[in-house]
Amino acid sequence: LADPLDHRDAGDLWVPGESESFEDAHVEHSISRSLLEGEIPFPPTS
């Protein structure tokens, strides 16, 4: 299965004055995604 996440666009939000955060990359760097580029338990976003 194709991974819908893309490092080139990692990061959900950047607002000056806010702490930097990478919600997208949390999924990319999850235990699940390390096990399998697929469906446990983060399947491709519908």
Partner: antibody, heavy 114, light 112 residues
């Protein structure tokens, strides 16, 4: 099978230190971002620390409530993360979980009391 | 900080009936690429939290499709279409968009 096993919890006096360990197995560890989340006796969940991977220079982030007192670290060769807790306060009393946000450990109890 | 509030804080449901839990954020959780960073967890009695829903509406693997998540930028709903005995516990919403990451206070689901 994915396993996250926290150890090191105990009863300690205010001002003392404690180090928690989270031993992981069952998944490729080195690229995973890990967190510590704690749960107060009132059952409120609080995210307290986050460590990224080597490719991200092991960047760390902390909640204000623990910044300067707690240190998160990892040893990729041992597939383990740590939480060094210094200057403990009674308000730090909680169950401490290590998590990848998808999988969670069973938790370990830390009680800070005189 | 991003504050999450939940309602109700406690709900009693007859098995087989539906239940809805609300989560509201004081800030938008809509990030880039139209990804909404709202997660739902269930903590069963005596257990660790388990992931149910990620990115507002995506079902985690192994979670029954009786569970569904929906919402907008700041208002979110977890629906359980036909509550079963195993659904008892405390439901938490969480956001992983802005530091510090935050959780809601939890909603306790009990059976009538």
């Amino acid at each position: 099978e994915v396993q996250l096993v926290e150890t090191g919890g105990s009863l300690v006096q205010p001002g003392k230190s404690l180090k928690l360990t989270c031993a992981t197995s069952g998944f490729p560890f080195s690229n995973v971002w890990m967190h510590w989340v704690r749960q107060s006796p009132e059952k409120q969940l609080e995210w307290i620390a986050h460590i990224k991977a080597k490719s991200d220079n092991y960047a760390t982030y902390y909640a204000e409530s623990v910044k300067g007192r707690f240190t998160i670290s990892r040893d990729d060769s041992k597939t383990t993360i740590y939480l060094q807790m210094n200057s403990l306060k009674e308000a730090d009393t909680a169950i401490y979980y290590c998590t990848g946000l998808d999988y969670w450990g069973q938790g370990v109890m830390v009680t800070v009391s005189s | 900080d991003t504050v999450l509030t939940q309602a109700p804080l406690s709900v009693s449901v007859t098995p087989g009936e539906s239940a809805s839990i609300s989560c509201r954020s004081n800030k938008s959780l809509l990030g880039i690429r139209d990804i909404t960073s709202l997660y739902w967890y269930l903590q069963k009695p005596g257990k660790s939290p388990q992931l149910l829903i990620y990115r507002m509406s995506n079902l985690a693997s192994g979670v029954p499709d009786r569970f569904s998540g929906s919402g907008s930028e700041t208002d979110f709903t977890l629906k359980i279409s036909e509550v079963e005995t195993e659904d008892v516990g405390v439901y938490y919403c969480a956001q992983f968009l802005r530091y510090p990451y935050t959780f809601g206070p939890g909603t306790k689901l009990e059976l009538k």
